[in-house]
Interface confidence: low
């Protein structure tokens, strides 16, 4: 999947299986990614687990889990708030669009999470205070935590180079550059560009990600995934000057 | 750099609202913030050898502890929660009848809350 980190680095990760996105004293988020096509290096998110840790008299530990074709509007225990404690309403789940869009607000840690199902796969977005991000017991033991450190270098796909190489080639594919088996030939570069332009008129990294995804999979739902990801940034990002990312911001992990 | 002293520093100054010389009746809270700060520096000590900001912090903590007669043992401030910024729009602060500290944490007292964003989508 495409990842935008807390430091506004933009990466395309081929990480497969379960990986931690966020891990701190209050919150743990883990994603499971699966290949989009058999034998493909490109992966998308098929499962998401969010654990809100027990916090004083505010909330009990609550676990939210979403999978492909299952986007519940409740925690795994069936509740929609923080439990029986006095401050239970400082954690709430709201269903925005049934089966497609859920918002979780954790007021006691100033955090808003948006989970969507777009096509077969899930998207995730979070707005969280830096103080919460940095609330960790031991920095030394922090492992690969994608939102903070980004993907390991050997798990990144340089989709910007792929985009550049494919530009203007029409239906021709640069197979060597492609991280996946060739998508259906009925989906030439020009069509991908047109589809993405429709939803993403600004040629930023979200637009480039959209083109990459369409060429990689031939699945038009990925256009919507990029579109909604940008919409979520507009809602959640505190710096309105950084909504669109353009330049290459890929960097070494952990920097 | 794996040395996280800047995080310890900013947490301490948030917790003390940037106050260099808290009033005497604030001392217990100030001491708790100092102990949290000291704990934070100890956690990052191994990766901070030779880091000037780290050692300046260590010395500063010792100095402030003695200036304010803080004991080394005692309560630490609850990490960051009394200084966390408000959670965004006004609607989300109006839908809860109880005003326990879970809600109080986010009454607006920071002009520019330091939020950050992460997102994951597509392939």
């Amino acid at each position: 999947p495409h990842l935008r980190t807390f430091t506004d680095r933009f990466q395309t990760c081929k990480v497969q299986g379960a990986w931690p996105l966020i891990d701190n004293n209050y919150l743990n988020v883990q994603v499971t990614n699966t290949p989009v096509l058999p034998g493909s290096a490109a992966t998308a998110t098929s499962k998401l687990t969010i654990i809100f840790k027990n916090f004083q008299e505010c909330v009990d530990q609550k676990v939210y889990q979403a999978e492909m074709d299952e986007l519940p509007a409740a925690f795994v225990d069936g509740s929609k708030n923080g439990g029986d404690k006095h401050g239970a309403n400082s954690l709430k789940i709201t269903e925005k669009v049934s089966g497609q869009h859920v918002e979780i607000r954790a007021k006691y840690i100033g955090t808003t999470i948006v989970v969507r199902q777009v096509g077969r796969y899930l998207t995730f977005a979070v707005r969280v205070p830096e103080e919460v991000v940095n609330a960790v017991e031991d920095w030394d033991s922090q492992g690969l935590y994608l939102c903070l450190r980004g993907c390991p270098l050997n798990q990144q796909i340089d989709f910007q180079a792929f985009h550049t190489n494919t530009e203007g080639t029409g239906a021709r594919r640069l197979a060597a550059a492609s991280p996946a088996p060739t998508a259906p030939e009925t989906f030439p570069y020009e069509t991908a560009v047109a589809k993405c332009k429709e939803k993403l008129p600004v040629e930023d990294l979200y637009y480039q990600a959209c083109v990459f995804d369409l060429l990689t999979t031939g699945d038009v739902n990925f256009t919507l995934a990029a579109y909604y990801a940008l919409e979520d940034v507009k809602m959640l990002h505190s710096n309105k000057d950084k909504l669109h990312l353009y330049e290459r911001t890929r960097d070494l992990p952990g920097r | 750099s794996p040395c996280k002293i800047l995080k310890c520093n900013s947490e301490f100054w948030s917790a003390t609202s940037g106050s260099h010389a808290p009033a005497s009746d604030d001392t217990p809270e100030f001491c708790a913030a100092l102990r949290s700060y000291a704990l934070c520096t100890r956690r990052t000590a191994r990766t901070c050898r030779g880091d000037l900001a780290y050692h300046s912090a260590v010395h500063g903590i010792e100095d402030l502890m003695s200036q304010h007669n803080c004991s080394k043992d005692g309560p630490t401030s609850q990490p960051r929660l009394h200084t966390l910024p408000p959670a965004g729009d006004s609607q989300e602060r109006s839908d809860s009848p109880e005003i326990c500290h879970c809600e109080k944490s986010f009454h607006k007292h920071s002009a520019t809350p330091n939020y950050t964003h992460c997102g994951l989508f597509g392939d």
Epitope: - | S1, C3, L6, C8, N9, S10, F12, W13, R49, G50, D51, L52, A53, H55, S56, A57, V58, H59, G60, I61, E62, D63, L64
Partner: antibody, heavy 120, light 109 residues
Framework: EVQLVQSGAEVKKPGASVKVSCKAS????????ISWVRQAPGQGLDWMGW????????NYAQKLQGRVTMTTDTSTSTAYMELSSLRSEDTAVYYC?????????????WGQGTLVTVSS | QSALTQPRSVSGSPGQSVTISCTGT?????????VSWYQQHPGKAPKLMLY???KRPSGVPDRFSGSKSGNTASLTISGLQAEDEADYYC?????????FGGGTKVTVL
Amino acid sequence: EVQLVQSGAEVKKPGASVKVSCKASGYTFTSHGISWVRQAPGQGLDWMGWISPYSGNTNYAQKLQGRVTMTTDTSTSTAYMELSSLRSEDTAVYYCARVGSGPYYYMDVWGQGTLVTVSS
Amino acid sequence: QSALTQPRSVSGSPGQSVTISCTGTSSSVGDSIYVSWYQQHPGKAPKLMLYDVTKRPSGVPDRFSGSKSGNTASLTISGLQAEDEADYYCLSYAGTDTLFGGGTKVTVL
């Protein structure tokens, strides 16, 4: 009054070593780092490194690694900077400076400077 | 060559304002809260004028102020006075790198 008093001017031959002292008074010596900064004639300030009197830890400028040694003597509240294998371009005024305490990093008190001349 | 770039000189008449810039990279200036400024008169030791970008030590006149935008920190002297004629240096600390700017000569006309 917080003060840093440095040793007197030195004239050295190329290849020799020089050791400059910096005596602190008016504050708790171990509560602040000591930085060393030099300034060649007509040039700008050049950071050389820093030492923690509290722990003895040092942080040297990359270009001086292996040639510079900073030490402190807490019993006399004195910091020392030794530079070896001197060359003519090391001719400069050498300053010690106290580093602000706590989360702040700045040099708030400076010594008067020690002129070191390297000449054959 | 310093990694922090300052103009070689700036000048102004008494009472005017002058601004000295200090431009670095995101790591040396942009992400650093540790930016300080020093004044140095000929033959004298430097003197701290501002620290942590904007803070003024006691004894420094309030006509000295600091700011930062992106990768550039600035020192502004408003109401320039004859005794402000000196060299000014910015310093930034980020990680384990400590850098001085090349210095700016302020001339009071």
